[in-house]
């Protein structure tokens, strides 16, 4: 499988809020022994590899946004701690899963990674992630509602292992 | 701080049965995958048994039919049950917690609880 | 039997380097991961995903992997690092460790 980022850049005005997401690409085995475990976490551009570095978002480790299931299943973040940030991460039958961001401050701009972890007999044997920026603005310049940019194809689809 | 205690280790006769618990704390455990590893004295690691979040397990081939692992994520407890025990199950048993994200490595373990099987 | 094989010793005066090396099949395509015991304690994780370092271990440690063979090398020896050391990795469903390797300082 394979993860891919509809949207590189997301440009956001202050206090509006924000859903970035990622969507699950391939075959996805939905056998009974396999979890998909899915999560989000900020980083920042390494020379070598971008997501390595795995930093809190509001605060909130990629522990507490995480969300476990198996193969293309529902589910979301019902955590009191992260919808007290402002948080709330979701995933959908389709393979999309996201995380929203509410009343974005300039504190919030930078770079989100997902992570999507194939749980077999009980260990990973494979992990993707897909990257994406924020920006959030401020004053005059600020668009007055998010305006997202889509990835290049072969962005979308250049998955390099977490 | 992450802490896991293991207890209900001691002395048990041969044919016997016991039963282990490790209590967790400092983090939320029903996140995490957990396990069981044993070591005989003075010998190595081996590896018994692992849980994942929602209860599905996994066994050490030798040991399946015996032992057999549960959880109360209510409880914050891992517990090891343990029948038919025998002279070479004597050993050092830890509760050890699964690494996340990457699901591989064991990052925190027990201090251990003693089981001897002696007659 | 051990699917991963470690030297039973290894040993080192201070200020020295050791490599304890762990081998076995396909461990190229493992993630090895890297134990130390203290005389009479617990487990502590050293070295994860081949080369990674918890936080709060010492840089001394390093990981390294190539081929058929994982090493764990510990520069600067010191008095306190005389422990059992253990490699780990996944063989199919089930978590298998490697015989372990006595690191004695001299």
């Known amino acids: 499988f394979k993860v891919a980022t509809p949207y590189s850049l997301y440009v956001c005005p202050e206090g509006q809020n924000v859903t970035l997401t990622c969507r699950l690409l391939g075959p996805v085995d939905k056998g009974h022994d396999v979890t998909f475990y899915k999560t989000w976490y900020r980083s920042s551009r390494g020379e070598v590899q971008t997501c390595s570095e795995r930093r809190p978002i509001r605060n909130l480790t990629f522990q507490d946004l995480h969300l476990h299931h198996g193969g293309h299943q529902a589910a979301n973040t019902s955590h009191d701690l992260a919808q007290r940030h402002g948080l709330e991460s979701a995933s959908d039958h389709h393979g999309n899963f996201s995380i929203t961001m509410r009343n974005l401050t300039l504190l919030d701009s930078g770079l989100y990674c997902c992570l999507v972890v194939e749980i077999r007999h009980h260990h990973s044997e494979h992990r993707v992630h897909g990257a994406m920026e924020l920006q959030v603005q401020t004053g005059k310049d600020a668009p007055s509602n998010c305006v997202v940019y889509p990835s290049s194809s072969q962005d979308s689809e250049n998955i390099t292992a977490a | 701080e992450v802490q896991l205690l293991e207890s209900g280790g001691g002395l048990v006769q041969p044919g016997g049965s016991l039963r282990l618990s490790c209590a967790a704390s400092g983090f939320t455990f029903s996140n995490y995958y957990m396990h069981w590893v044993r070591q005989a004295p003075g010998k190595g690691l081996e590896w018994v048994s692992s849980?994942?979040?929602?209860?599905?397990?996994s066994y050490n081939p030798s040991l399946k039919s015996r032992f057999t692992i549960s959880r109360d994520n209510s409880k914050n407890t891992l517990y090891l049950q343990m029948n038919s025990l025998r002279a070479e199950d004597t050993a050092v048993y830890y509760c050890a917690r699964l690494g996340i994200p990457f699901f591989t490595y064991l990052d925190y373990w027990g201090q251990g609880t003693l089981v001897t099987v002696s007659s | 039997q051990s699917v991963l094989t470690q030297p039973p010793s290894a040993s080192g005066t201070p200020g020295q380097r050791v490599t304890i090396s762990c081998g076995g099949n396909?461990?190229?395509?493992?993630?090895v991961h890297w134990y130390q015991q203290l005389p009479g304690t617990a487990p502590k994780l050293l070295i994860y995903?081949?080369?990674e370092r918890p936080s709060g271990v010492s840089d001394r440690f390093s990981g390294s992997k190539s081929g058929t063979s994982a090493s764990l090398a510990i520069s600067g020896l010191r008095s306190e690092d005389e422990a059992d050391y253990y490699c780990?990795?996944?063989?199919?469903?089930?978590?298998?460790f490697g015989g372990g390797t006595k690191l004695t300082v001299l």
């Open positions: 849980i994942s979040f929602t209860g599905s397990t």
């Open positions: 780990q990795a996944w063989d199919s469903s089930t978590v298998v």
């Open positions: 995903e081949d080369t």
């Open positions: 396909n461990i190229g395509s493992k993630s």
